[in-house]
């Protein structure tokens, strides 16, 4: 943990600009309070300064969590984790952020989706996701429903389907009804990862039944 007691950083871009250019876990401070949170900072990819808000890589962490757990975050920042909707909401309402989603399949291929504008609404509005300006190699159509699906969990059903997407597909996500993605679905190992309706899905790259090997969601200020 690379926290300097005198430093207060809102995101990994501020950490980077302060001279800390090594990948690792840093302590960040909530924009609207003195509350702190630990996050993994990617200081190498695409110029660095990326705050990792989600990572899946080995199935070691259970992502079928409650609303509160998705709100405050869970897992291990050095491995699989969810940073926390409340922190991300506060952060992305301070200034303009970009969201990059990096994906790996089981055949050694990688792809990404980059959204030039990203923010989460407040908890009052169910951490609705807002995205614009899609580019990248993981599909020309957004695999996150646009505009603005609300976040849903197993105990917080805000989707547009009578089926309760979070219970059916597992994990908390911006499901819509139930939508073309779920990066928080069940982790399936290689050779068990096809024809899985409740896996780690990014439809406009790998189709509906393919469960991915690894995913990373990262954010950075647009003016970095």
């Amino acid at each position: 943990d690379y926290k300097d007691d005198d430093d207060k950083f809102r995101d990994c871009a501020e950490v980077f600009k302060s001279g800390h250019t090594t990948n690792g876990i840093y302590t960040l401070t909530f924009p609207n309070s003195t509350e702190e949170i630990k996050a993994y900072c990617d200081m190498e990819a695409g110029g660095g300064g990326w705050t990792i808000i989600q990572r899946r890589e080995d199935g070691s962490v259970d992502f079928q969590r409650t609303w509160k757990e998705y709100k405050v975050g869970f897992g291990n920042p050095s491995g699989e984790y969810w940073l926390g909707n409340e922190f991300v909401s506060q952060l992305t309402n301070q200034q303009r952020y970009v969201l990059k989603i990096h994906l790996k399949d089981w055949e050694g291929n990688e792809a990404y989706s980059l959204y030039e504008h990203f923010y989460l609404s407040s908890e009052e509005l169910n951490y609705r996701i807002h995205l614009k300006g899609l580019t990248g190699t993981a599909g020309k159509i957004s695999s996150i429903s646009q505009p603005g699906a609300d976040f849903s969990t197993k105990d917080g059903d805000n989707d547009k389907c009578i089926c309760k997407c979070s219970q059916m597909l597992t994990g908390g996500w911006w499901f819509d009804a139930c939508g073309p993605s779920n990066l928080n679905g069940m982790y399936y190992p290689q050779r068990q990862n096809t024809n899985k309706f409740n896996g780690i899905k990014w439809y406009y790259w790998k189709g509906s039944g393919y469960s991915l090997k690894a995913t990373t969601m990262m954010i950075r200020p647009a003016d970095f």
Epitope: H117, E124, R128, H130, K132, Q146
Partner: antibody, heavy 121, light 107 residues
């Protein structure tokens, strides 16, 4: 249901300021989204003028930047357009509208019915 | 600013026809393009957003497609109530800009 209603004078003299009000019902303008002014000239050309976001930040069309101001009154759930130094070329139907994104320009899903403004002496 | 060139300006069609309107952006607009319908005496109404997504309650005879610089809007089977002006709009970059409009008239 979300409703927007424009109001203001239908006739403004050249060189004066045009002031319009948009009253929003069914949704708080501080909750989310951006709140826009768009105008439609005779001949149907549409021009985006600017917005005020739910957080209070503003963005304006560069072609109007020196003349335009968008403000709000959160207690009344209203936002306002002021356009200074008007000329007859500002004659148009003025619409307020909600856009689907809160921090940047976007498509607009709810529109007012429009108010016609003529600039003439 | 991105210029949206919309064609044609006028479409004269019969009920039941299929119609297509195109919009060409002067530079890439990704998929951040919307289509609006404006009936006589009314304000514009959102039909399509993000190039291909149908807005809530919009009949499925209205479709949109495209990415980058070339966008298409189609009505599969024109009905009498579709008489209107149709506009495209890009919101990929600020300021958002509109096409000049296509007036759909029923024979």
């Amino acid at each position: 249901d979300v409703q927007l209603q424009e109001s203001g004078p239908g006739l403004v003299k050249p060189s004066q300021s045009l002031s319009l009000t948009c009253t929003v019902t069914g949704y708080s303008i501080t909750s989310d989204y951006a709140w826009n002014w768009i105008r439609q000239f005779p001949g149907n050309k549409l021009e985006w003028m600017g917005y005020i976001s739910y957080s209070g930040s503003t963005s304006y069309n560069p072609s109007l930047k020196s003349r335009i101001s968008i403000t709000r009154d959160t207690s009344k759930n209203q936002f306002f357009l002021q356009l200074n130094s008007v000329t007859p070329e500002d004659t148009a139907t003025y619409y307020c509208a909600r856009s689907t994104f809160g921090h940047y320009v976007s498509s607009m899903d709810y529109w007012g019915q429009g108010t016609s403004v003529t600039v003439s002496s | 600013s991105i210029v949206m060139t919309q064609t044609p300006k006028l479409l004269l069609v019969s009920a039941g026809d299929r119609v297509t309107i195109t919009c060409k952006a002067s530079q890439s607009a990704s998929n951040d393009v919307a289509w609006y319908q404006q009936k006589p005496g009314q304000s514009p109404k959102l039909l399509i957003y993000y190039a291909s997504n149908r807005y809530t309650g919009v009949p499925d005879r209205f479709t949109g497609s495209g990415y980058g610089t070339d966008f298409t809007f189609a009505i599969s089977t024109v009905q009498a109530e579709d008489l209107a002006i149709y506009f495209c709009q890009q919101d990929y970059s600020s300021p958002p800009t509109f096409g000049g409009g296509t007036k759909l008239e029923i024979k």
